[in-house]
């Protein structure tokens, strides 16, 4: 992960490290998971498109009382241009499948890593 920083664009907030820090946090969550993450809470699955940051935040913000993902929730807010509140879903949110938070985090992490490999970050 240490070599990911060069892919992110320097400049405005969040800084170039923000994306790397998000990935590192997702790695920490997946690696340090002992008991079921967030007591096995279920969240809505999302479409992993360029707008996925807002969708991911919309989904995860509905998990309360889970300190393990609070930092991820805060970080994602820096990637979403819109205000996201618990119980709110954009009209584009695909709400047909619920998955465990642990799987959600794993899917998001794998997708972000895949995007780095494809060079999709400026």
């Amino acid at each position: 992960l240490t070599c990911l920083g060069g892919f992110a664009s320097p400049g405005p907030v969040p800084p170039s490290t923000a994306l790397r820090e998000l990935i590192e946090e997702l790695v920490n969550i997946t690696q340090n998971q002992k008991a079921p993450l967030c007591n096995g809470s279920m969240v809505w699955s999302i479409n992993l498109t360029a707008g996925m940051y807002c969708a991911a935040l919309e989904s995860l913000i509905n998990v309360s009382g889970c300190s393990a993902i609070e930092k991820t929730q805060r970080m994602l807010s820096g990637f979403c241009p819109h205000k996201v509140s618990a119980g709110q879903f954009s009209s584009l949110h695909v709400r047909d499948t619920k998955i465990e938070v642990a799987q959600f985090v794993k899917d998001l992490l794998l997708h972000l890593k895949k995007l780095f490999r494809e060079g999709q970050f400026n």
């Epitope: 992110a8 405005p12 969708a55 241009p81 819109h82 400026n122």
Partner: antibody, heavy 118, light 109 residues
Framework: EVQLVESGGGVVQPGRSLRLSCAAS????????MHWVRQAPGKGLEWVAI????????YYADSVKGRFTISRDNSKNTLYLQMNSLRAEDTAVYYC???????????WGQGTLVTVSS | EIVLTQSPATLSSSPGERATLSCRAS??????LAWYQQKPGQAPRLLIY???NRATGTPARFSGSGSGTDFTLTISSLEPEDFAVYYC???????????FGPGTKVDIK
Amino acid sequence: EVQLVESGGGVVQPGRSLRLSCAASGFTFSNYGMHWVRQAPGKGLEWVAIIWYDGSNKYYADSVKGRFTISRDNSKNTLYLQMNSLRAEDTAVYYCVKGSGDIPFDYWGQGTLVTVSS
Amino acid sequence: EIVLTQSPATLSSSPGERATLSCRASQSVSSYLAWYQQKPGQAPRLLIYDASNRATGTPARFSGSGSGTDFTLTISSLEPEDFAVYYCHQRSHWPPIFTFGPGTKVDIK
């Protein structure tokens, strides 16, 4: 009904400044990211800038970086574009655009024309 | 920076005909591609998002397809109001940089 009304356009000399405004209504302005998109006469669309719902983050196209500043006043439901060091190539219709969820541009204003000419 | 190329630049067709517009990205944009329609003197209007999803109010005759680098907008049977300029558009994952194609003008033959 969502309404976005741009103002502040006009004729300006190269090197001078201009500030565009966009009055928003029909939605909770303070909840949404907003953009400026421009279109030179007879040309295609060019994204200019985005600002987060709370003004915390701003991003710009390379062509305007360092010269243009996007800002907002949520208490007035107004979006701004401060344009400095204007060039002839900045001549365009400037659109104020609302974002939403996965769609960056779901509602557009009718635009205001900026002409940079000596 | 991802560059979008649209073809043809101009498509001359008649009402009732099928129209196929192409958009090619210089590198993969996954399925994140949108199509906008613009009529003279008007602001653009969203038609399709995420390559194939119709936006609210988009008639069923409009459909989008493709993924990766090659995308298509199809108008199954042209109506008089469909003669306009069509732009494809993509958003980079991070930072949020937005790019439009040069446009395809659909005019009456």
